[in-house]
Each structure stands twice: as C-alpha cells, then as structure tokens.
Interface confidence: medium
C-alpha cells in the first residue's frame, strides 16, 4: 500500500525555484502526477497540520514542513490525480479532470546553508561518520533545480565527484538523479553550465570542499557503496548532471490564432518570448501535444510548418523531441520556420 511514508515513495515539488516548496507531484507506476488538494476527502481549501508531510520534506533533503494545503492553480501538467483513503496514501487514486483539480502545495523549510569545514580532511584514524550519506546538486546562482555539480556527503565529509569522460556510468547517473528526487538522467553538463562559473560580484556560497570522491561502483544500489575518497585533484572534470526533473521548464504559448488554443508557437527564454522554429527532431505530434496541454487545451487537431521564405526570420530552436526535455534553447538567426498549431478547444 503506497504512501508517502514508504521508503521507495518518490515525490517532487514543482513550479518554484526551490526543490523545497511548490506543487506536489508524485511518481506512480506510469509517471509523474500532480496531486489534487481534494484528495483524501479534503476540501480544496482545507489546511492540514504540515507535520503530516514531514517524510516528504525529509526525502527531498529539506527541513521541516511549514504548510500543506491548496496551491494557486497556475499550471496543470498532463496528469492530475485525486487519491482516497488515509492522508498521504497513493494506493487508490484516479485521474482527475484538470479543470476540477486544485493542486496540493507543500512548503518545507529551506535546508540551512552550513559552511563546510575548510580544514584538511581528518586523519584516516577518525571513525567513519554515522550520519546517512546524502547527495546534493549545486546549481549556479539563479540556476536550475535538478541540474548542477554533484556533491556527495558522508557525515560531515563532503566533496565533488571526480569524473572521466571514458567512465561508463549511465546506471550510476540514473541512480543519482533518482536519489535526488529528480527523475532520470538526461545528460552531463559542462562545468560552466553546472555552476562552476561564478559571478565575480557575488560571494561564493560553495567554497571548494575539503575532499573529493571517485566513482567506485557504477552499478551501486545504495549511496555508501558508490564512491571512495581520494585526494582533491587540482584539475580534471567533476560530475555534473542534468536530470529530467529540471526546473524551470521551457514555457510555451500560442499567438495569432482565433482562440488561446491555436496559433504560432512561441517559447520563453528568460523574459523574452520568441517564435519556436521547426526542427527535424520534432516531426511527431508529441511536442505539440505537450504544447496543447500547457495551454490547458485538448489534444492536437493539426499543426503545420509555415514557410520561412524570409532569410532574416529569427527564433528559438529546441534540439529535443519534446520541449520538456529542453534544458536550453538555441537561437536561430535565419530561416526560422514557425509552426502553427491547432489544439482542441475545451470551451468551444
């Protein structure tokens, strides 16, 4: 009987810039689902004693829960569920109509930023620390959740993981992303993307940690068996990952149509909206199904690529099949072919 007290229960908090607050989504056998606040016989406006969600906050490596209750309905993913039975139980859930679902929000205390010790590693005679090992992804300032340099902590010892490009570590990366409540592994990040680049005007919160780890067993199934301590390397790469649960996701909208459910697809890079250019990697309707869902419309009716006769037409390009897989958008400065999508209008 799956509940948020189970050791293998997976949850994440989305729609914020922090892994410790947001809209509650849970992973059930067929993927990620947003939890409706009407679950477990509650009203959509009911507030709960937040301590009931302490296991969820713990699993996200956050502090204690501060609030548990309705989240403003600003975004509805492809799948939302209402669950029944005891609060926190997910063994009896049914899919909900998106327009009926008020999402459930949880705020956990941000983990306290402790300055790691800057002393040399303790001598090897020191008994091994007893605190459970844990992982942390360090993103660059203002960077993405579920993307960054991996740091491994065993008790008070913490450091980055030395990584050689020839290491065959796909299983390990999936295990790490999963352990971080970040879904599955997408790709390795160069260090500049992963948080090594530092704004010179900003104090560095993460000073180099006193020890470093090396991959010991890339097929490990518990953290304590994955890495071994090594002397810190002056050079060489450190392990930096992008996991599928990265936030914020690319936002899309449809413009120039006769309703919000049709139009030319635009995406947002920072504060700027720009046309999304057609790409050969997105020739199936999967991308457009996702765009339609984001507009809270029905499924795709049709899509067509508009002619890019103008060599100066510009826009943004996503090299992946689905926009939700796009960690970065690339600029296309000429011959951008726009795409006109028509989705089913739920309120014709």
């Amino acid at each position: 009987r799956l509940s948020w007290y189970d050791p293998d229960f997976q949850a994440r908090l989305t729609r914020s810039n922090s892994k410790c607050q947001g809209q509650l989504e849970v992973y059930l056998k067929d993927g990620w689902h947003m939890v409706c606040s009407q679950s477990w016989g509650r009203s959509s406006k009911q507030w709960e004693d937040p301590s009931q969600a302490s296991k969820v906050c713990q699993r996200l490596n956050c502090g204690v829960p501060l609030s548990l209750g309705p989240f403003l309905v600003t975004y509805t993913p492809q799948s939302s569920i209402i669950c029944y039975g005891q609060l926190g139980s997910f063994s009896n859930c049914s899919h909900s109509r998106n327009d009926m679902c008020h999402s459930l929000g949880l705020t956990c205390l941000e983990p306290q930023k402790t300055t790691p010790p800057t002393t040399r590693p303790p001598p090897t005679t020191t008994p091994e620390p007893t605190a459970p090992p844990r992982l942390q992804l360090v993103a660059q300032s203002g960077g993405q959740h579920c993307a960054g340099v991996v740091e491994f902590y065993s008790g008070s010892l913490g450091g980055t993981i030395s990584y050689e490009a020839q290491d065959k570590t796909q299983d390990l990366e999936n295990f790490l992303c999963n352990n971080l409540q970040c879904g599955s592994f997408l790709k390795h990040l160069p260090e500049t993307e992963a948080g090594r680049a530092q704004d010179p005007g900003e104090p560095r919160e993460h000073q180099p940690l006193p020890i470093q780890w090396k991959i010991q067993n890339s097929s490990c199934t518990s953290l304590e068996h994955c890495f071994r301590k090594i002397k810190p390397q002056k050079s060489g790469r450190v392990l930096a990952l992008l996991c599928s649960g990265f936030q914020p996701k690319v936002q899309s909208r449809l413009v120039g149509g006769s309703s919000i459910c049709e139009g030319t697809v635009e995406v947002r890079q920072g504060a700027q909206w720009a046309a999304l250019c057609d790409s050969s990697s997105a020739r199936s309707s999967l991308r457009w199904e996702e765009v339609c869902r984001e507009q809270q419309c029905g499924s795709v009716n049709s899509y067509r690529v508009l002619d890019a006769g103008d060599p100066t037409s510009r826009g943004l390009f996503c090299p992946h099949q689905k926009l939700s897989q796009c960690h970065e958008l690339w600029e296309r400065n000429s011959y951008c072919k726009k795409v006109f999508v028509t989705c089913q209008d739920p309120n014709p």
Epitope: S16, S18, G22, D49, L66, F71, G105, L106, L109, S141
Partner: antibody, heavy 119, light 108 residues
Framework: EVQLKESGAELVRPGGSVKISCKGS????????IHWVKQSHIKTLEWIGL????????SYNQKFKDKATMTVDKSSSTAYMELARLTSEDSAIYYC????????????WGQGTLVTVSS | EIVLTQSPTIMSASPGEQVTMTCRTN???????LHWYQQKSGASPKLWIY???NLASGVPTRFSGSGSGTSYSLTISSVEAGDAATYFC?????????FGGGTKVEIK
C-alpha cells in the same frame, strides 16, 4: 478572528538585547509558520527569517543569523524573537506575520513593535 | 539573492486616473510566488494581491496585477483618495524571501 498581537515598544541601550513577542489567536497556531520582518526608518522591508510553529525549526536570512534568535512556545501560541548586540542600525519596527500556504505569502501581520536603540 | 526593483519610487495621481507601478526582478521568479502588500502611513502592511493577479479578500476590483518572469505590475484602473499608500512587491520563489523598495502613491 485571526490576530497577531505583538509586545509593546522597547527602548534599549547600545550593546544590549531585547526579546519581542507575537501571540497568535483565532486559528490553529501550529498549522502556520511565523515570519519576522524589519522595517527601518527608510521604510524598506527586510525579511529576517521564519519559525515553524509546530517543530520550532528556524530559517534565517543570512544577514540576520548572528543578530536574531527565534523561538516558539506552543502552549501559549506565542512566537518570540530576541535581538542581540544592538546598535542604532537595529532601530526599526519589527513585524511578525503569518505564513499562508504553499504560495508563501503573509496573510496576517502583527501591529509591529518599535525598537529604539539609544544611549 | 533575488533583488526586486520597484518603479517609480513615488507617483502622484488625480482621482479617476489609471496608475501602474512595476516590480522587476534580477532573475526569473514563479508568478505563483510574487505578491503585493499595501501599507498606509502608521499601519502594518496588508496582503493586497497574491500569486501575481489574485486580489486578497476585501480588495476593490479596480486593482489588478499581472506579469511573469522578471517583470510584474500592479494597476489601479481609477484611483481613489483611499488608495494613497505605499505598495510593496515580495517574492519567495528564491531563497531568501525579498521585498521591493516600495512605490508610494499620492493623491493630488
């Protein structure tokens, strides 16, 4: 009716400390965290930190972590904040506010406690 | 930290005029976590708009909020004498929670 009632104005000598209180009523006190906010004479608002009223766990703005200490007494539904090593820069109105929900806004505020640091 | 810059600092308007104030952030914040408070002279701040565009209980419908990403605004469609106050924006999308410097609205 939801209310947050703060303690009265304080006049403190430089180098001294002061403990101000915020009593919640009209709701389940332990279901909502309490934040503390400073408003200085130039009228800007600065977040000091928050305390979980159910567990007593705290989160401080790094700027105030050596200045403020937040505690809670569940039996009297009261949150406290102690300010230490006071200087004239700490002269301000200090507000407590109730944390409302997963969207992180403050739906009720106390009336404020004026702290004046002067010799 | 996320810095919120409000403009203008002070604005003066005649009754019936429309006024708009903006709140810009130095990095993108989720619209669910951008809120506005009204503070009248000598009083505590009051929640005014939450989640970018939702009016708090008792707030007149002449107030509206909008925005996304790094740019947000509060508009009063037809300003009244009772709207004279300072309006602060606040975010808790990124840690630590921060406020804007405020926009003071004066009525001519």
């Amino acid at each position: 009716e939801v209310q947050l009632k703060e303690s009265g104005a304080e006049l403190v000598r430089p180098g001294g400390s002061v403990k101000i209180s915020c009593k919640g009523s009209g709701y389940t006190f332990t279901n909502f965290a309490i934040h503390w906010v400073k408003q200085s004479h130039i009228k800007t608002l600065e977040w000091i930190g928050l305390i979980s009223t159910s567990s007593g766990d705290v989160s401080y703005n790094q700027k105030f972590k050596d200045k403020a200490t937040m505690t809670v007494d569940k039996s009297s539904s009261t949150a406290y904040m102690e300010l230490a090593r006071l200087t004239s820069e700490d002269s301000a109105i200090y507000y407590c506010a109730r944390h409302y929900g997963a969207n992180n806004y403050f739906d009720y505020w106390g009336q404020g406690t004026l702290v004046t640091v002067s010799s | 930290e996320i810095v919120l810059t409000q403009s203008p600092t002070i604005m003066s308007a005649s009754p019936g005029e429309q006024v708009t104030m903006t709140c810009r952030t130095n990095s993108s914040v989720s619209s669910s976590y951008l809120h506005w408070y009204q503070q009248k002279s000598g009083a505590s701040p009051k929640l005014w708009i939450y989640g970018t565009s939702n009016l708090a209980s008792g707030v007149p419908t002449r107030f509206s909020g909008s925005g996304s990403g790094t740019s947000y605004s509060l508009t009063i469609s037809s300003v009244e004498a009772g709207d004279a106050a300072t309006y602060f924006c606040q975010q808790y999308s990124g840690y630590p929670l921060t406020f804007g410097g405020g926009t003071k609205v004066e009525i001519k």
